[in-house]
Amino acid sequence: QPSVSPGEPSPPSIHPGKSDLIVRVGDEIRLLCTDPGFVKWTFEILDETNENKQNEWITEKAEATNTGKYTCTNKHGLSNSIYVFVRDPAKLFLVDRSLYGKEDNDTLVRCPLTDPEVTNYSLKGCQGKPLPKDLRFIPDPKAGIMIKSVKRAYHRLCLHCSVDQEGKSVLSEKFILKVRPAFKAVPVVSVSKASYLLREGEEFTVTCTIKDVSSSVYSTWKRENSQTKLQEKYNSWHHGDFNYERQATLTISSARVNDSGVFMCYANNTFGSANVTTTLEVVDKGFINIFPMINTTVFVNDGENVDLIVEYEAFPKPEHQQWIYMNRTFTDKWEDYPKSENESNIRYVSELHLTRLKGTEGGTYTFLVSNSDVNAAIAFNVYVNTKPEILTYDRLVNGMLQCVAAGFPEPTIDWYFCPGTEQRCSASVLPVDVQTLNSSGPPFGKLVVQSSIDSSAFKHNGTVECKAYNDVGKTSAYFNFAFKGNNKEQIHPHTLFTP
């Protein structure tokens, strides 16, 4: 029994005065606690605790379940203990078959002995199977067998406590070890869509998937820059061992414009945290925004091809698209397609393919698109560049020589005089009158220019050249005339086209 110096409180003394006591099943247990300030006896085995306020603990007929630690405590909180084994050949183990262990921690197989004198107290695998090679354990007859540093691989391991009694191996009831994994990585989080675009009043629903080794991972939806608790619903699954999945679904049944913002799915475990965000944009009504991919004023050479291309954003989805020219709708020659196959795509492309354009096909080409909320349109002004064409070249009654040419851009007309038989007309002649005429054709068509010179200025035989040109090309017409005596012969016009 402990001894202390006089004047200091001392622990109680127990009779019999030994740390361990072995009794046979059916015998009496009689324990006496001597202390002037006796408070209570406490009995503990496995997770059991019982109390007794009498200073003498008497169990008339001991049973195996009376095996355990008996502690006497005084009013100073000082205590003394004795451990009693109730030897019962029919019940060598007291057990609590609950067996849960955390990875990398120790866990106790609770199978304390009722007889400390049996030998080879250890663990054995069920049905004769060997235990994992790396499994280490420490037996303690009063508590059970401590498995050291539990491994994930021990999950669902079936085992027995075992002793040798009179040369024979005796097994306890079986235990199934459930291993709770340690977190060795952050949770894996993903979101059903990275962005959402909705009209006011529509339902917003987004699902975050959290994957981890166990269900003790924490997760929540948060609104960035807000502390408001969001309403979420959970579904979860164990896809086999150490493969847990949770789906956290956030719903706003009728979204408003001020619900727009960034929502974060946050998850953490003891290793660390992870998050993923989704963006919600709520608009009061749908929209269409058109972006021309080429200049809306287009110049194209006669006979060439041009593609009129627009990109447009449409929400909700576009319902009707058309290309129009001169109040006529194209039934072919155009295509319309989404910019990406992403399900949240709102961007589309429309292309009108104009081939081998003629000078008469210039004009306004209009793209129209609509959805359930709005209509939108964009116009392209197409100008077809054409080489000048000399429409008329005449000597008028007043003696003027007149040349009329059409083309786009507007042609310039120059006049040249070639004396005698020279082929090259280099001496330029200034026109008397130049006019741009209103074309009777459609707008964007060829521009008509009329130029006149006074033929009375020419005193010698020769040729007069009318040359019409623009950025695309040039064309010439010629007037031949000769003098007979003092009279000017009939002028014979002819043309020579220069490519």
Partner: nanobody, 123 residues
Framework: EVQLLESGGGLVQPGGSLRLSCAAS????????MSWVRQAPGEGLEWVSA????????YYADSVKGRFTISRDNSKNMLFLQMNSLRAEDTAVYSC????????????????RGQGTLVTVSS
């Protein structure tokens, strides 16, 4: 064959009481600490209470402490849960199960768990 059969559930008004019972057979009942767990509609499994093999030690989730009492009768292989001052949030399917994990996580589940009995707390 192991069987855990719960009874005693039903509809009760807020503030009312119920006593759940669990009859165990097919295994050594007093070899297990026992637990009550519950699962509300659309929610995960929640541990409620546990009791040691001989009944000397009891454990409760914070949400039920002071309102629920767990007990057992090893001679009859019976587990009980007395539920007082019931609230709407106690509505769930209640099951008895073998084992007690002091961490409260029950990773890997239970060796055995019953089908459960439905408790509905509503006015």
């Amino acid at each position: 064959e192991v069987q855990l059969l719960e009874s005693g559930g039903g509809l009760v008004q807020p503030g009312g009481s119920l006593r759940l019972s669990c009859a165990a057979s097919g295994f050594t009942f007093d070899s297990y600490a026992m637990s009550w767990v519950r699962q509300a509609p659309g929610e995960g499994l929640e541990w409620v209470s546990a009791i040691s093999t001989g009944g000397g030690s009891t454990y409760y989730a914070d949400s039920v402490k002071g309102r629920f009492t767990i007990s057992r009768d090893n001679s009859k292989n019976m587990l009980f849960l007395q539920m007082n001052s019931l609230r709407a949030e106690d509505t769930a399917v209640y099951s008895c199960a073998t084992g007690y994990d002091s961490s409260g996580y029950y990773y890997g589940g239970f060796d055995y768990r019953g089908q459960g009995t439905l408790v509905t707390v509503s006015s």
